[in-house]
């Protein structure tokens, strides 16, 4: 999917309202020394994409995070303010309800969730390498695209 | 817990060069962004500028192009602010501050270092 | 650069008194700005995120409102501790900006 037309604002309005406070509940009782974000992103659609597939794509060590409170916010979020969004994701929520049931929090989640973090606040505030001009967000009317 | 310990105040001459350091602990060094803001006596926040401690990205002031360049270095968790060709106009407070969880505040500052620039 | 206009520049404000000041933006920055605290010889703390979010063991005593151009920053009720400089601050384009910053004083 292509995440160049949604809503970013809306998207940042929905994860500073909840998503953020239960990605905080999930992680509570991990060290912040303990990992070190290794997923980056360098635009907020690229910080979607990368967001999406920590999110719902289970991984080696980490298979359930997709039903997750945070998670299911996440997608909400990206099907309300994402146009199309959506209908791409029918084959992923089969998929889904195939994985795991029991939710299981792993050190290899931890680790992910944390990495989710970064890449969100990324999302928030994009920090772009200067050609010029110096902005950093998208217009409100959120169909400006940011050039490199 | 979270610090930011910034080096001594300096005293320095005009036209030379000083470069202060912003030592972070308590956090994962690489995960977030560190900011640079400065203060005038009696004045307001001016921001200077950003790094991201990971890859080394940065982001300018306009008005501080130039003067400042920002550094950081992972193995022993410290950012730099260096500023060149100094004036009278510099003799502020410089403050370094991490980003919040968010990205979207500054939670944390260091607890700023005084730079004179004086002949 | 977006200006961020900020009044007063100065209250003179008694123990108990609600404390409203105002921050405007010279374009909108959507909902990205924060309120800081900053005491005599001290660093800035923060105290409001993204307008109206308080930043963790933050009082609810401020309180952040607004939205696009003009927002609004109150101290339901002042108590000595907050006799301090204000900050706004936007964070919706850089370079970042801040307001001038409103210092509360005694009567």
């Known amino acids: 999917y292509d995440f160049t037309n949604c809503d970013f604002e809306k998207i940042k309005a929905a994860y500073l309202s909840t998503i953020s406070k239960d990605l905080i509940t999930y992680m509570s009782g991990t060290k912040s020394t303990e990992f070190n974000n290794t997923v980056s992103c360098s635009n907020r659609p690229h910080c979607l994409t990368e967001i999406q597939s920590l999110t719902f794509n289970p991984t080696a060590g980490c298979a359930s995070l997709a039903k997750e409170m945070f998670a299911m916010k996440t997608k909400a979020a990206l099907a309300i303010w994402c146009p199309g969004y959506s209908e791409t994701q029918i084959n992923a929520t089969q998929a889904m309800k195939k994985a795991r049931k029991s939710k299981v929090t792993t050190n290899k989640c931890l680790e992910q969730v944390s990495q989710l973090q970064g890449l969100w606040r990324r999302f928030n505030r994009p920090l772009l390498k200067q050609q010029g001009s110096s902005d950093y967000k998208d217009d409100d009317d959120k169909h400006h695209h940011h050039h490199h | 817990q979270v610090q930011l310990q910034q080096s001594g105040a300096e005293l320095v001459r005009p036209g030379t060069s000083v470069k202060v350091s912003c030592k972070a602990s308590g956090y994962a060094f690489t995960n977030y962004l560190i900011e640079w803001v400065k203060q005038r006596p009696g004045q307001g926040l001016e921001w200077i500028g950003v790094i991201d401690p990971g890859n080394g990205d940065t982001n300018y002031n306009e008005n501080f192009k130039g003067k400042a360049t920002l550094t950081a270095d992972k193995s022993s968790s410290t950012a730099y602010i260096e500023l060149s060709r100094l004036t009278s106009e510099d003799s502020a407070v410089y403050f370094c501050?991490?980003?919040?969880?968010?990205?979207?505040?500054?939670?944390?500052w260091g607890q700023g270092t005084t730079l004179t620039v004086s002949s | 650069s977006i200006v961020m206009t900020q009044t007063p520049k100065f209250l003179l404000v008694s123990a108990g008194d609600r404390v409203t000041i105002s921050c405007k933006a010279s374009q909108s920055v959507s909902s990205d700005v924060t309120w800081y605290q900053q005491k005599p010889g001290q660093s800035p703390k923060l105290l409001i995120y993204?307008?109206?979010n308080h930043y963790t063991g933050v009082p609810d005593r401020f309180t952040g409102s607004g939205y696009g151009t003009d927002f609004t920053f109150t101290i339901s009720s002042v108590q000595a501790e907050d006799l301090a400089v204000y900050f706004c601050?936007?964070?919706?384009?850089?370079?970042?900006?801040f307001g001038a910053g409103t210092k509360l004083e005694l009567k």
């Open positions: 501050a991490r980003e919040d969880n968010t990205g979207t505040a500054f939670d944390y």
């Open positions: 993204y307008v109206s």
């Open positions: 601050q936007q964070h919706h384009r850089f370079p970042l900006t």
